[in-house]
């Protein structure tokens, strides 16, 4: 089941999926001046059986003689600056992608692919957070988020991570600032369907956290 929302935003942090659950979709996007080949795949899909998972379909880009009309292939002008986040500065949690059954590795690049990857995660996907260069972590718990489904609504758990500037004075554990997630879902807003207290999506993904080998947009 697709996650119909995005991992929460943690200021000054990026996140990465170490492996992708079966059912994950990756848009076949091409860089400016290129387009998907006619009758080419729209998505790559992580599929598999109990013993092996792999990406179905191959993304292929070709030079576009005419203007590329595919929507959102490149970042909007106001998003350009945000989306230049690169790979996390230090190693992520030691998760061996190959050892996770029912998961796919990061797909290899394809020729002339776009500068960002747009993934569509599924319920059960886990992403790991890390502070960007120049910030250090104050942990209150796991620096990870999982997409869960309750009453037919999907939501991501809130990672217990605060990233503070190197020069800032560390706070004592009891004095940590609250998570800066302006539209984070209060615990009181977790009742069942068709009420005004349905799960609200944690703050929509900010591109400052979009990261993988390429910059990544998570859908």
């Amino acid at each position: 089941e697709l996650c119909d929302d995005d991992p929460p935003e943690i200021p000054h942090a990026t996140f990465k999926a170490m492996a992708y659950k079966e059912g994950t979709m990756l848009n076949c996007e091409c860089k400016r001046g290129f387009r998907r080949i006619k009758s080419g795949s729209l998505y790559m899909l992580c599929t598999g059986n109990s013993s092996h998972s792999s990406w179905d379909n191959q993304c292929q880009c070709t030079s576009s003689a005419t203007r590329n009309t595919t929507k959102q292939v490149t970042p909007q002008p106001e998003e350009q600056k945000e989306r230049k986040t690169t790979e996390m500065q230090s190693p992520m949690q030691p998760v061996d992608q190959a050892s996770l059954p029912g998961h796919c590795r990061e797909p290899p690049p394809w020729e002339n692919e776009a500068t960002e990857r747009i993934y569509h995660f599924v319920v059960g996907q886990m992403v790991y957070y890390q502070c960007v260069q120049g910030y250090r972590a104050l942990h209150r718990g796991p620096a990870e988020s999982v997409c869960k489904m309750t009453h037919g609504k999907t939501r991501w758990t809130q990672p217990q991570l605060i990233c503070t500037g190197e020069m800032e004075t560390s706070q004592f554990p009891g004095e940590e600032k609250p998570q800066a997630s302006p539209e984070g879902r209060p615990e009181s807003e977790t009742s069942c369907l068709v009420t005004t207290t349905d799960f609200q999506i944690q703050t929509e993904m900010a591109a400052t956290m979009e990261t993988s080998i390429f910059t990544t947009e998570y859908q």
């Epitope: 089941e1 697709l2 119909d4 929302d5 059912g23 569509h120 609504k153 349905d198």
Partner: antibody, heavy 116, light 106 residues
Framework: QVQLVQSGAEVKKPGSSVKVSCKAS????????MHWVRQAPGQGLEWIGY????????EYNQKFKDKATITADESTNTAYMELSSLRSEDTAVYYC?????????WGQGTLVTVSS | DIQMTQSPSTLSASVGDRVTITCSAS?????MHWYQQKPGKAPKLLIY???ELASGVPARFSGSGSGTEFTLTISSLQPDDFATYYC?????????FGQGTKVEVK
């Protein structure tokens, strides 16, 4: 309570465009994707696509990618869907539906009639 | 795309009847969701994640199935249940619906 109120019925000429609105209230607009669904007369439901209101990111059903353009205005908590190059086959009721999983709230629908 | 095939397309039944609607997906999916629609109205969520009843939905409705075959059952049809029912998958894009099953008075 959560409400999605759509704009009124439209009658359009072939080749023209129409912009349908969906005003949300009763929840944090930017916290949920807004999806659009089409229903031609006497037919079933077809998913058109969605928008993430606070980022403007859209995902479309390939069938509608050259037909529909979904936008949103955070300041008015309103999502829009513009249909271009209208043809008689575009005559349908268009619904907005709140995402975040299953579609728990729907607009009342907007009938777009394309006729010369 | 995942195609959703509902059967029957039309079902004639009487109040008190047990009604079963099936939905077959062209590929395996995680869950099925069901909506009810009455003429001139927007669809209404009926059952989510295959078997869970949406808020306010009577217990005479139930859902079951897995993989590619799913079923919606109304144990004892009531006058308010005459409507069109749609199955829906959101396991992969594009999201798709069944063509609908109209439950009409026999």
């Amino acid at each position: 309570q959560v409400q999605l109120v759509q704009s009124g019925a439209e009658v359009k000429k072939p080749g023209s465009s129409v912009k349908v609105s969906c005003k949300a209230s009763g929840y944090t607009f930017t916290s949920y994707r807004m999806h659009w669904v089409r229903q031609a007369p006497g037919q079933g439901l077809e998913w058109i696509g969605y928008i993430r209101p606070n980022r403007g990111y859209t995902e479309y059903n390939q069938k509608f990618k050259d037909k529909a353009t979904i936008t949103a205005d955070e300041s008015t908590n309103t999502a829009y869907m513009e249909l271009s190059s209208l043809r008689s086959e575009d005559t349908a009721v268009y619904y907005c539906a709140r995402g975040g999983g299953v579609f728990d709230y729907w607009g009342q629908g907007t009938l777009v009639t394309v006729s010369s | 795309d995942i195609q959703m095939t509902q059967s029957p397309s039309t079902l004639s039944a009487s109040v008190g009847d047990r009604v079963t609607i099936t939905c077959s997906a062209s590929s395996s999916i995680s869950y099925m969701h069901w909506y009810q629609q009455k003429p001139g109205k927007a669809p209404k969520l009926l059952i989510y994640t295959t078997s869970e009843l949406a808020s306010g939905v009577p217990a005479r409705f139930s859902g079951s199935g897995s993989g590619t075959e799913f079923t919606l059952t109304i144990s004892s049809l009531q006058p308010d249940d005459f409507a069109t029912y749609y199955c829906h998958q959101r396991s992969t894009y594009p999201l798709t619906f069944g063509q609908g099953t109209k439950v009409e008075v026999k």
